[in-house]
Interface confidence: medium
Amino acid sequence: RTVPPMVNVTCSEVSEGNITVTCRASSFYPRNITLTWRQDGVSLSHNTQQWGDVLPDGNGTYQTWVATRIRQGEEQRFTCYMEHSGNHGTHPVPSGKVLALQSQW
């Protein structure tokens, strides 16, 4: 079976003009998934991103996340890239205040 992930992108304010953007994938199966941040379409280097492990979410499916810090005002340059079971999608950082974007493939 294949269950596509829900993708949720959030921003949280941090100091000195930087914000943390977090991309969460949840409710997917099987466990193998690709999740990475891209800037202007290019994947960020590994050492600028922080990942959570892929863990059960209690419903027979899985969840994970990836986060990175970016300059406030440059949100539109960043997207979260997701690949799962042959499907893939790109999810933008929400503009404006601390918002959440949720999408279902």
């Epitope: 193998n32 492990d53 059960p56």
Partner: antibody, heavy 119, light 108 residues
Framework: QVQLQESGPGLVKPSETLSLTCTVS????????VHWIRQPPGKGLEWIGM???????DYNAAFISRVTISVDTSKNQFSLKLSSVTAADTAVYYC?????????????WGQGTLVTVSS | EIVLTQSPGTLSLSPGERATLSCTAS???????LHWYQQKPGQAPRLLIY???NLASGIPDRFSGSGSGTDFTLTISRLEPEDFAVYYC?????????FGQGTKLEIK
């Protein structure tokens, strides 16, 4: 720094169980999973299986009837048990960390331990 | 099971030359899940390139990777003496997570 160290008996008799431990430092067992891989002398690499941070396991179907991978977080150790061994199980056995964001690549390896199966 | 076939089995080159190593998968592999490892005699493998084209930490930029689908390539632009080793491709696209049989890069 990140380190993994395999240990266990270097000689195992046919039909017995091979038991190895992988002691890790420099990272948390609750944050990273571990793979076990083996390499017969003069040959290539073979993936045995892995354990995720929640303790669930994925095994190579070629070993599934006789392999067990587990974790003891209190000792910072992962373990591999392979039952009913034969001479074909003679190999260098490696543990390797499952990297985050490396899409399950193995980003740090132990130095390996040679296990010989012989009577 | 996805079978990875590496070619050539042995590659004999001199320092300073360019090396091109090939990895062909028996069925399509996501580029995210195709990795390369380097192994020197008596040592454990080390991660060289992850996700087809990304250099692992501490790997010099004379190494590069490319490819998609079933055909992947590892290139070393200018061989240094320490590059002579065995190279393995590895897929984590579908269990069991297989390795190629290796390409031995030796000094000519």
């Amino acid at each position: 720094q990140v380190q993994l160290q395999e240990s266990g008996p270097g000689l195992v008799k046919p039909s017995e169980t091979l038991s190895l431990t992988c002691t890790v430092s420099g990272f948390s067992l609750t944050t990273y999973g571990v793979h076990w891989i083996r390499q017969p002398p003069g040959k290539g690499l073979e993936w045995i299986g892995m354990i995720w941070t929640d303790g669930t396991t994925d095994y190579n179907a070629a070993f599934i009837s006789r392999v067990t991978i587990s974790v003891d977080t209190s000792k910072n150790q992962f373990s591999l048990k392979l039952s009913s061994v034969t001479a074909a199980d003679t190999a260098v056995y490696y543990c390797a960390r499952k990297g985050h964001g490396y899409y399950y690549a193995m980003d740090y390896w132990g130095q390996g331990t040679l296990v010989t199966v012989s009577s | 099971e996805i079978v990875l076939t590496q070619s050539p089995g042995t590659l004999s080159l001199s320092p300073g030359e360019r090396a091109t190593l090939s990895c062909t998968a028996s069925s399509s592999v996501s580029s995210s899940y195709l990795h390369w490892y380097q192994q020197k005699p008596g040592q454990a493998p080390r991660l060289l390139i992850y996700s087809t084209s990304n250099l692992a930490s501490g790997i010099p930029d004379r190494f590069s990777g490319s490819g998609s689908g079933t055909d992947f390539t590892l290139t070393i632009s200018r061989l240094e003496p320490e590059d002579f080793a065995v190279y393995y491709c590895h897929q984590y696209h579908r269990s069991p997570f297989t390795f190629g049989q290796g390409t031995k890069l030796e000094i000519k």
